[in-house]
C-alpha cells in the first residue's frame, strides 16, 4: 500500500490529526521535500545575522553577517568579528600580529613570514604585519653565467587550516 503522505508536496505536511490530508505549512515554517509529517521552523537571522534569503513554505531562510562580521561554519552558523589586516582575533578581541607574523585578511590568524633561506633565497622585500616577505633570487642565481630563467619556487603552504 502506498503511504498517503507521499502525495504531500513540498510546502505542506501530512496532517496526522486530520486523516493524513496535506495541510500547508503554517507561517514561519517550511518543508523542502514532499511526504513530510511536520514542517520545520524557519531559521531566524537575528543579532549579528542578517537575512540573505527569506524563508518560504518550501525553503529555509539563509543568513549572512552584518558588516564588521564574517560567516563561519556550514550555512553561516556563526558570525565572527572582523579584524584589520595585520591583526588576529583572540578571546580578548583583535590583537596586532606579533613580529615575524602577518595577516593580509580581515579574518583568520597571523601566519609566520616565509623563511626565504629555506629555499636558498634572499629577502627581497621585508615582511610587515600585513604582508609576507618577498623572496628574491638565490645568491647562486646572481652569479655570472647563471641561467637567466629559473623555475619559480614552489608556493609554501602556511601551517593553518583553510579559512
Amino acid at each position: 500500500l502506498q503511504d498517503p503522505c507521499s502525495n504531500c508536496p513540498a510546502g505542506t505536511f501530512c496532517d496526522n490529526n486530520r486523516n493524513q490530508i496535506c495541510s500547508p505549512c503554517p507561517p514561519n515554517s517550511f518543508s523542502s521535500a514532499g511526504g513530510q509529517r511536520t514542517c520545520d521552523i524557519c531559521r531566524q537571522c537575528k543579532g549579528v545575522f542578517r537575512t540573505r534569503k527569506e524563508c518560504s513554505s518550501t525553503s529555509n531562510a539563509e543568513c549572512d553577517c552584518t558588516p564588521g562580521f564574517h560567516c563561519l561554519g556550514a550555512g553561516c552558523s556563526m558570525c565572527e568579528q572582523d579584524c584589520k589586516q595585520g591583526q588576529e582575533l583572540t578571546k580578548k578581541g583583535c590583537k596586532d600580529c606579533c613580529f615575524g607574523t602577518f595577516n593580509d585578511q580581515k579574518r583568520g590568524i597571523c601566519r609566520p613570514w616565509t623563511n626565504c633561506s629555506l629555499d636558498g633565497k634572499s629577502v627581497l622585500v621585508n615582511g610587515t604585519k600585513e604582508r609576507d616577505v618577498v623572496c628574491g633570487p638565490s645568491p647562486a642565481d646572481l652569479s655570472p653565467g647563471a641561467s637567466s630563467v629559473t623555475p619559480p619556487a614552489p608556493a609554501r603552504e602556511p601551517g593553518h587550516s583553510p579559512q
Partner: antibody
Framework: QVQLQQSGAELARPGASVKMSCKAS????????MHWLKQRPGQGLEWIGY????????NYNQKFTDKATLTADKSSSTAYMQLSSLTSEDSAVYYC??????????????WGTGTTVTVSS | QIVLSQSPTILSASPGEKVTMTCRAS?????IHWYQQKPGSSPKAWIS???NLASGVPARFSGSGSGTSYSLTISRVEAEDAATYYC?????????FGSGTKLEIK
Amino acid sequence: QVQLQQSGAELARPGASVKMSCKASGYTFTFYTMHWLKQRPGQGLEWIGYINPSSGYTNYNQKFTDKATLTADKSSSTAYMQLSSLTSEDSAVYYCARSDGSSSKWYFDVWGTGTTVTVSS
Amino acid sequence: QIVLSQSPTILSASPGEKVTMTCRASSSVSYIHWYQQKPGSSPKAWISATSNLASGVPARFSGSGSGTSYSLTISRVEAEDAATYYCQQWSSNPFTFGSGTKLEIK
C-alpha cells in the same frame, strides 16, 4: 504507552562536555520532533532547540548555538544532546520533550524524565 | 524574543474556590500552551492552543484568551491542583515560557 526515558545524572568539571540521551518508545520516532529544554533549580523553562529525527534538521535558540549539539539515531529511536565548555551556569535539569509537528502548534505533549547536570570543580 | 509575564507569582486558594492566573505576552501571539509541574517531577502537558485540555486533565480547568492576554481558570480548586503552571508560546522563534504561577492550597 508513549515514554521518553532520559539518561542518568551527570557530574562534570568546568570546561568539560557531557552527552545525554533520550530514548523514545511507544510511537513512531520519525513522526514527531524532539525538543530539549533547560530548567535551573527553582527557575522556569528555557527552550534549547529541536531536531526533526526524520530529516536531521535542527533549529536552536540562538542563546544555545555554541553550547548544545542535537543529534538523533533513528535505528534506536534515541535523541542526544551534547553540552560543551561547561560552566556553573549549565548546572540544571535538562528535559527532552516530544512535539506533534502535525498540529503545527509546537506543543510539548510528552516530556522526558529529566537529566540532572551538575558542574563542579 | 517574545516575553511571557505570568501573574500572580504565587496564588493561594482554599479547596472549592475559583482561581484564575494570567499570562501576558510582550507582543501578540496566536495561541498559548499551558503545562503543570509538581516539585521533583517533569512538566506535564495541560492545555494546548489556548483552550484544549490535554488527555486526563479534569474539566474544572479551562483556558481562554487572545492577542497578548491569556488565562487559565480552575472552577473549583482541589488539593491535587497544587503545582506550578507555566505558559508557553511559539508565534515567534525562539519558544518562550512564562516564569510560572505557583498554586498553593490552604
